[in-house]
């Protein structure tokens, strides 16, 4: 049997050591003990007696099925306890009585059906994070379960087999910053929602089939819900159940952010929010995020005209990796307040983008992200976006463009352009002179000779440049990142010719450690202030004698340098 490895600060690692019991020889010097992925099965009352100063105890996936009632009695300093993914079929309040300093408790993934016959947590007055439940057996949430807990930063409940929710069970916790509920069906959703309305600031619903969700008025008085964010992850929705979910929004008037991740919509987007008051109550929602939305019938998808009015005040929309190939012109025109739009990892081509960015589309838009779509012509892209009079920032990275032409048109206010990972080999005057920030990293550039009078930041890492670009091209440059190119040297004159340069990242290049370069680095201790990745990323490539040495440490031979 292997032993623990502990460092000087008392952090002990015993993961995956085939321990069949808590190892002996534990001491008061230990601050953190990780015994995850072992075969411990049993924790006796004296096993942890010596660990009086332990702050972190991690016993994840260690096949524990029995813990003596007083096993943790000496752990008054414990702040973090992870008992997840073990074989504990019942939980005992006596375990937690002594743990008055506990801030984090993870009991998830154990095969209990309830949280025990008595309240587990009345003494845990410092608890901030609690994770409970499991996939198969946890079936009942009762009023006694959370007694004593008044405020939590995070509460995660995995109750995919929930058969009973006792009304008001979650109401006793007065303040929950982030509640994550794993529910397979929507059966108890309304009851739970009523109980958490006045306490939860961020509600996350996971793995829930909402296809049969039906709204009914909640038995609550006028509440001022603090809920700011609502997220659905791995949920299944239909057009009808989406309409029903919208009705919940009348209870959360401060909601500002809605998120859908990995959801499936078994519908056509034929939403019909029946109640006009829903529309006004969406008034504070500013951010809508959709990632990996699966719509089996996405070629029949409606133009969302039924929810146009819901989105008129939204400022930030992300629809990522959801097979979007066209945003209808009329929809774009209704997004009057939209300032930020991210359509990354979709299927947009210029010719259909033209329809989306039609006259009057996205009139307030400042930032547009079209990273990793199917754009092919930089010239066409720029021309199509001329309708966006307020656009200042454009990300068209990770598209594969045809060679850049000599001239292009771009929205006149554009200041930021991301062309990273687009396969470009040459930069031409197609790039607008108005830019303040340009990212051309991860391309095939072997030179950069474009005059950009307003450029403040240039990101050109992972290319093939052999020298730093000429400083006269960028008279007001503040930041240049030119890592992972083929730069062999830089000199006092080169760096000095950038009058305003504050930050240079030039590590991981092929430095030739010549007498000139090494004497310059030795004579200029202030390099560390401008070279943010100095000294570890600056290694000699040649001569062979110095290969792999840091420039800072390399010493030229007296003979070579005084010939």
């Amino acid at each position: 049997q292997e032993s623990l490895s502990c460092d000087a600060s008392g952090v002990c690692d015993g993961r995956s050591r085939s321990f069949t019991s808590i190892p002996s020889g534990l001491t008061a010097a230990m601050k953190s003990l990780d015994l995850s992925f072992n075969k411990i099965t049993y924790i006796g009352h004296g096993d942890l007696r010596a660990c009086a100063n332990l702050q972190v105890l991690i016993l994840k996936s260690s096949r524990i099925n029995t813990i003596e009632g007083d096993a943790f009695y000496s752990l008054g300093s414990l702040e973090h306890l992870d008992l997840s993914d073990n074989h504990l079929s019942s939980l005992s309040s006596s375990w937690f009585g002594p743990l008055s300093s506990l801030k984090y408790l993870n009991l998830m993934g154990n095969p209990y059906q309830t949280l025990g016959v008595t309240s587990l947590f009345p003494n845990l007055t410092n608890l901030q994070t609690l994770r409970i439940g499991n996939v198969e057996t946890f079936s009942e949430i009762r009023r006694i379960d959370f007694a004593g807990l008044t405020s939590l930063n995070e509460l995660e409940i995995k109750a995919l087999s929930l058969r009973n929710y006792q009304s008001q069970s979650l109401k006793s916790i007065r303040d929950i910053h982030h509640l994550t509920l794993h529910l397979s069906e929507s059966a108890f959703l309304l009851e739970i929602f009523a109980d958490i309305l006045s306490s939860v600031r961020y509600l996350e619903l996971r793995d829930t089939n909402l296809a049969r969700f039906q709204f009914s008025p909640l038995p609550v008085d006028e509440v001022s819900s603090p809920m700011k964010k609502l997220a659905f992850r791995g949920s299944v929705l239909t057009d009808e159940s989406f309409n029903e979910l919208l009705k919940l929004l009348r209870y959360i008037l401060e909601l500002s952010e809605v998120e859908f991740d990995d959801c499936t919509l078994n519908g056509l987007g034929d939403f019909n929010p029946s109640e006009s008051d829903v529309v006004s109550e969406l008034g504070k929602v500013e951010t809508v995020t959709i990632r990996r939305l699966h719509i089996p019938q996405f070629y029949l998808f409606y133009d969302l005209s039924t929810v146009y009015s819901l989105l008129e005040k939204v400022k930030r929309i992300t629809v990522e990796n959801s097979k979007v190939f066209l945003v209808p012109c009329s929809f774009s025109q209704h997004l009057k307040s939209l300032e930020f739009l991210d359509l990354s990892e979709n299927l947009m081509v210029e010719e259909y983008l033209k329809n989306s960015a039609c006259k009057g589309a996205w009139p307030s838009l400042q930032t547009l992200v079209l990273s990793q779509n199917h754009l092919r012509s930089m010239q066409k892209t720029g021309e199509i976006l001329l309708t966006l009079k307020n656009l200042t920032s454009l990300d068209i990275s990770r598209n594969t463009f045809h060679p850049m032409p000599d001239s292009c048109q771009w929205p006149e206010k554009m200041r930021f352009l991301n062309l990273s990972s687009t396969g470009i080999r040459v930069v031409k005057t197609c790039i607008p002179q108005t830019l303040e920030v340009l990212d051309v990293s991860n391309n095939n550039l072997d030179s950069f000779s474009l005059f950009l009078p307003r450029l403040q930041e240039l990101y050109i890492s992972r290319n093939k440049l052999k020298t730093l670009p000429d400083a006269s091209l960028f008279p007001v440059l503040l930041v240049m990142k030119i890592r992972e190119n083929a730069v062999s040297t830089f000199s006092k004159d080169q760096l000095g010719s950038f009058p305003k340069l504050e930050t240079l990242e030039a590590g991981d290049n092929h430095f030739v450690c010549s007498c000139e370069l090494l004497s310059f680095t030795m004579e200029t201790p202030a390099l560390a202030q401008i070279l943010v990745d100095w000294p570890d990323s600056y290694l000699c490539d040649s001569p062979p004698r110095l290969h792999g040495h840091r420039l800072q440490d390399a010493r030229p031979s007296v003979l070579e340098c005084h010939q």
């Epitope: 012109c329 990892e345 299927l347 329809n355 199917h374």
Partner: antibody, heavy 118, light 111 residues
Framework: QVQLQQSGPELVNPGASVKLSCKAS????????INWVKQGPGQGLEWIGW????????NFNENFKDKAALTVDTSSSTAYMELHSLTSEDSAVYFC???????????WGQGTTVTVSS | DIELTQSPASLAVSLGQRATISCRAS??????????MQWYQQKPGQPPKLLIF???NVESGVPVRFSGSGSGTDFSLNIHPVEEDDIVMYFC?????????FGGGTKLEIK
């Protein structure tokens, strides 16, 4: 440059299965859908279905739902189509094609001829 | 399924003249202002080659003598002036509704 290289011709017995491959190069494989199209001898084109390598999602022409299975191996940028319970009706040239803009097939493989005969 | 009917099935045309091939869909292929109709050219023993997408957008690298027009249910491919290299098969294809369907093809011949 963009290329889709398909496997060689197949001569198979009735009732057997065959697995055709389509190796992609010159573009980010996971960013595009891969479609499969059938062309019978001297006939028109028939869309079989698509697969999106990024998430493995598929969509089929109902006529091919029980006939074809589509898979991908993203590590080798290769798409596969397996055809089951072959009959003489399945003798055809099968093309893979890259789906761009969600709607059009801008690059095609050279085609694989499948002949079902005993 | 959306049925695409191409006409004529074969078209005899003089080199240097205009050729017009029609494609009629059994229902509209419009998708919010964009017609999801494509045209492909196929030479013997080769795979089809994309000419036009979205009814009228000429694919990069395709000669300017090819153009597409139409909306709703009626579409046409124009070739002007016809060159010898163009005397092959042409197919239309819709991607408005699944399953995607192709027209039966039009064979261009020299008059």
């Amino acid at each position: 440059q963009v290329q889709l290289q398909q496997s060689g011709p197949e001569l198979v017995n009735p009732g057997a299965s065959v697995k055709l491959s389509c190796k992609a190069s010159g573009f980010t494989f996971t960013t595009y859908g891969i479609n499969w199209v059938k062309q019978g001898p001297g006939q028109g084109l028939e869309w079989i279905g698509w697969i999106y390598p990024r998430d493995g999602s598929t969509n089929f022409n109902e006529n091919f739902k029980d006939k074809a299975a589509l898979t991908v191996d993203t590590s080798s940028s290769t798409a596969y189509m397996e055809l089951h319970s072959l009959t003489s009706e399945d003798s055809a040239v099968y093309f893979c094609a890259r789906l761009t803009g969600g709607t059009f097939l801008d690059y095609w493989g050279q085609g694989t001829t499948v002949t079902v005969s005993s | 399924d959306i049925e695409l009917t191409q006409s004529p099935a074969s078209l005899a045309v003089s080199l240097g003249q205009r050729a017009t091939i029609s494609c009629r869909a059994s229902e509209s292929v419009e998708y919010y202002g964009t017609s999801l109709m494509q045209w492909y050219q196929q030479k013997p023993g080769q795979p089809p080659k994309l000419l036009i997408f979205g009814a009228s957008n000429v694919e990069s690298g395709v000669p300017v003598r090819f153009s597409g027009s139409g909306s709703g249910t009626d579409f046409s491919l124009n070739i002007h002036p016809v060159e010898e290299d163009d005397i092959v098969m042409y197919f239309c294809q819709q991607s408005r509704k699944l399953p995607w369907t192709f027209g039966g093809g039009t064979k261009l011949e020299i008059k």
